[in-house]
Amino acid sequence: VSITKCNSDMNGYCLHGQCIYLVDMSQNYCRCEVGYTGVRCEHFYL
């Protein structure tokens, strides 16, 4: 799978994580920080 950093317009898309652009899938993906989940890493779990 080809990946690259998200475009600058996606700054802030991932609330608690790193934004990755999955080129072949034509979509952005949030790699969440430990303790966070959700499509945009918006949910905290203990």
Epitope: T4, N7, D9, M10, G12, Y13, L15
Partner: antibody
Framework: QDQLVQSGAEVKKPGASVKVSCKAS????????IQWVRQAPGQGLEWMGR????????KYREKFEGRVTITADTSTNTAYMELSSLRSEDTAVYYC?????????WGQGTLVTVSS | DIQMTQSPSSLSASVGDRVTITCKAS??????IAWYQQKPGQAPRLLIQ???TLQPGVPSRFSGSGSGTDYTFTISSLQPEDIATYYC????????FGGGTKVEIK
């Protein structure tokens, strides 16, 4: 199946406002960003602005600042684009476009006609 | 705002010809360019994103290349069904469309 269903065609008088809706099904708009694009008859595509429904923040093309308002109601999974002070050159098909989780998935378009 | 200058605005070519359209950005867009095909009365159809990544179901005669500020879209062998208007879109910083290229059969 993911869908963006837009409201029906509108006819407005110059100076009036129009509000176009864009209802999402099959996905949560909070996971995406919703862009708005328009196309006047026989003309090219023009990006107007976008909203991040989760955060509520918006970005607009400079030429539309002060005249366009993009909102989202996450409880109904619907985005809206309101354009005020309409003039004849605002006659166009208006599209909502999903971006973020999937690259550029388009609604069917809404024709807005401005005529006296 | 980033400006996108697309050329030519129209072209006429024969079936089987190689067709090339260019888009020049006013600043580096880091390969974040997409190409759309639009036929009359239809919504635009995404062909290519991230400079050269073909969307599923799009024929391999369509291709894209470029980097920095200069990008190219190519139809290697024009077919009658390719008659349409083509647009580039930069999506690095907000969004800007090129002015479009109307492709006709000679």
């Amino acid at each position: 199946q993911d869908q963006l269903v837009q409201s029906g065609a509108e006819v407005k008088k110059p100076g009036a406002s129009v509000k176009v809706s864009c209802k999402a099904s099959g996905f949560n708009i909070k996971d995406t960003r919703i862009q708005w694009v328009r196309q006047a008859p026989g003309q090219g595509l023009e990006w107007m602005g976008r909203i991040d429904p989760l955060r509520g923040n918006t970005k607009y093309r400079e030429k539309f600042e002060g005249r366009v308002t993009i909102t989202a109601d996450t409880s109904t999974n619907t985005a809206y684009m309101e354009l005020s002070s309409l003039r004849s050159e605002d006659t166009a098909v208006y599209y909502c476009v999903r971006s973020g989780t999937l690259f550029d998935f388009w609604g069917q378009g809404t024709l807005v006609t401005v005529s006296s | 705002d980033i400006q996108m200058t697309q050329s030519p605005s129209s072209l006429s070519a024969s079936v089987g010809d190689r067709v090339t359209i260019t888009c020049k950005a006013s600043q580096d867009i880091h390969k974040y360019i997409a190409w759309y095909q639009q036929k009359p009365g239809q919504a635009p159809r995404l062909l290519i994103q991230y400079t050269s990544t073909l969307q599923p179901g799009v024929p391999s005669r369509f291709s894209g290349s470029g980097s920095g500020t200069d990008y190219t879209f190519t139809i290697s062998s024009l077919q009658p069904e390719d008659i349409a208007t083509y647009y580039c879109l930069q999506y690095d910083n907000l969004r800007t469309f090129g002015g479009g290229t109307k492709v006709e059969i000679k």
